[in-house]
């Protein structure tokens, strides 16, 4: 009679995480008498998955009734599969022995691969804000997927980006994998409303990719442009000077008026107007009592935006054309910012 062979007909089996894996195994003979055991791995570190003779294996069920005398089907089902279950499974026939059963013949092994979905991509931008024309890096990470093959794309406002580098780890075989990608994005002044999107496609997602987004409003700083103008004289000795602060983002802004280098007033941008592109405009004005000045006045609008070094714009106020009012020593009125846009 021909010697018993252990047949594992499936070289590989692919199962989605959470599903049940069926590992097939048949023997070609009832002799020698002895139990079957299933192992993951062939080496000294192999792990016992099922022992026909003894033990408790709650996730494993047999396909046929192993208690029947003439049974030669030793296939098993493993429930609730996770990526950690990946590996090569061996169906091993033991020969009855005393005191211990002796390993007799192994099947060729069935490689169990687990399909696991990637986690939702997490996109993160730079720690500090950057200004238009600068290049910033965004990272995208997704974890826990299997098999290793995966596609990652970057978009900015629907336009695909090309300047990025992607790594899938680990390089060798693993139960599951992670992807890490870094994209470079050049900022423009119009990017306050822009979004950067990382899109991950994987066989487990059935053509419906996962997306992670980052708003460039968290990343961009648009510095303001300043314009100081002198309005027509309101009263005999008063001049209205306005400082237009335009196209800035974010809103955090402090403005200081200086008269001939001396601080006249400091205020914080509160009631701003929003532009279509998401940037803000704001205006502050100063009433200058020209009769208090013998000489020309240098008025400076100094703006500190989002904790950056101050930028300023100056305006020379000619006072020689105005008659001096005796007894006045007030250089400027501490008015609040004008909520009306005066152009």
């Amino acid at each position: 009679e021909e010697e018993l062979q252990v047949i594992q007909p499936d070289k590989s089996v692919l199962v989605a995480a959470g599903e049940t894996a069926t590992l097939r195994c048949t023997a070609t003979s009832l002799i020698p008498v002895g139990p079957i055991q299933w192992f993951r791995g062939a080496g000294p570190g192999r792990e016992l998955i099922y022992n026909q003779k003894e033990g408790h294996f709650p996730r494993v069920t047999t396909v046929s009734d192993l208690t029947k005398r003439n049974n030669m089907d030793f296939s098993i089902r493993i429930g609730n599969i996770t990526p950690a279950d990946a590996g090569t499974y061996y169906c091993v026939k033991f020969r009855k022995g005393s005191p211990d059963d002796v390993e007799f013949k192994s099947g060729a092994g069935t490689e169990l691969s687990v399909r696991a979905k990637p986690s939702a991509p997490v996109v993160s931008g730079p720690a500090a804000r950057a200004t238009p024309q600068h290049t910033v890096s965004f990272t995208c990470e997704s974890h826990g997927f299997s098999p290793r093959d995966i596609t990652l794309k970057w978009f900015k406002n629907g336009n695909e980006l090309s300047d990025f580098q992607t790594n899938v780890d680990p390089v060798g075989e693993s139960v599951s994998y992670s992807i890490h990608s870094t994209a470079k994005v050049v900022l423009t002044r119009e990017d306050v409303h822009s979004q950067v999107i990382c899109e991950v496609a994987h066989v487990t997602l059935q053509g419906d990719p996962l997306r992670g987004t980052a708003n460039l409003s968290e990343t961009i700083r648009v510095p303001p442009t300043l314009e100081v103008t002198q309005q027509p004289v309101r009263a005999e000795n008063q001049v209205n000077v306005t400082c237009q602060v335009r196209k800035f983002y974010p809103q955090r802004l402090q403005l200081t008026w200086l008269e001939n280098g001396n601080v006249s007033r400091t205020e914080t941008a509160s009631t701003v107007t929003e532009n279509k592109d998401g940037t803000y405009n704001w205006m502050s004005w100063l009433l200058v009592n020209v009769s208090a000045h013998r000489d020309d006045v240098k008025l400076t609008c100094q703006v500190e935006h989002d904790g950056q070094p101050a930028v300023s714009k100056s305006h020379d106020l000619k006072v020689s054309a105005h008659p001096k009012e005796q007894g006045s020593n007030t250089a400027a009125e501490n008015t609040g910012s004008n909520e009306r846009n005066i152009y």
């Epitope: 993951r40 791995g41 080496g43 000294p44 570190g45 792990e47 090569t88 026939k93 390993e103």
Partner: antibody, heavy 115, light 110 residues
């Protein structure tokens, strides 16, 4: 003891089978691994087989090597040798060990792959 | 793939001295202790020194000491003898059923 045999000069692409003969053990349970060492290089694990004949391989070795068991030997087949496969091939036995260590080694057999 | 990084590549010490070799695994070895150390001399097969990360193999002097767990392991050779001049390899065993070696460390005894 374990002893390798079959090492020789072969031309690239010509399959070669090495044998590892095991003697002097009551073989209730053992594992035999094949390891190679290129001249002046380190040890490189190829794969392993157990007494029942179940074999597994290093990822780089899959398809390039086949480990099988006969009644008297454990064989390593180099399916399509290249000059990079030139090395001394060792078979190493893990006997009575449960931590993946190989405590019995053969002297090695030299394989040279050259035109 | 699982990678075992051995440092240093070469070390020199005087007779009676102590040598420490490090072996770092890219992932935890199986059961945190599937790590062995071997000694190899030119023209000879490797000889098992330590298994299970810290257990001395039969006939190996107690001057050889293995320690560590998980991903970081150390072989220490104290009271160095001239006969200890050799190349030393670590070997890990992994859940994925592979048993690779580190790159080796040459020990020179002065």
């Amino acid at each position: 003891s374990v002893e390798e045999s079959g090492g020789r000069l072969v031309t690239p692409g010509t399959p070669l089978t090495l044998a590892c003969t095991v003697s002097g053990f009551s073989l209730i349970s053992y594992y035999i691994s094949w390891v190679r060492q290129a001249p002046e290089k380190g040890l490189e694990y190829i794969g392993i087989i157990n007494i029942g004949g179940g074999a597994s391989y290093a990822s780089w070795a899959k398809g390039r090597f086949t480990i099988s068991k006969t009644s008297t030997t454990v064989d390593l087949k180099i399916t399509s040798p290249t000059p990079e496969d030139t090395a001394t091939y060792f078979c190493a036995m893990s006997y009575g060990m449960d931590t993946g260590a190989f405590n019995i080694w053969g002297p090695g057999t030299l394989v040279t792959v050259s035109l | 793939a699982q990678v075992l990084t051995q440092t240093p590549a070469s070390v020199s010490a005087a007779v009676g001295g102590t040598v420490t070799i490090s072996c770092q695994s890219s992932e935890s070895v199986y059961k945190n202790n599937f790590l062995s150390w071997y000694q190899q001399k030119p023209g000879k097969p490797p000889k098992l020194l330590i298994y299970g990360a810290s257990t001395l193999a039969s006939g190996v002097p107690s001057r050889f000491k293995g320690s560590g767990s998980g991903t970081q392991f150390t072989l220490t050779i104290s009271d160095l003898e001239s006969d200890d001049a050799a190349t030393y390899f670590c070997q890990g065993g992994y859940r994925t059923d592979i048993y690779p070696f580190g790159g080796g460390t040459e020990v020179v005894v002065k």
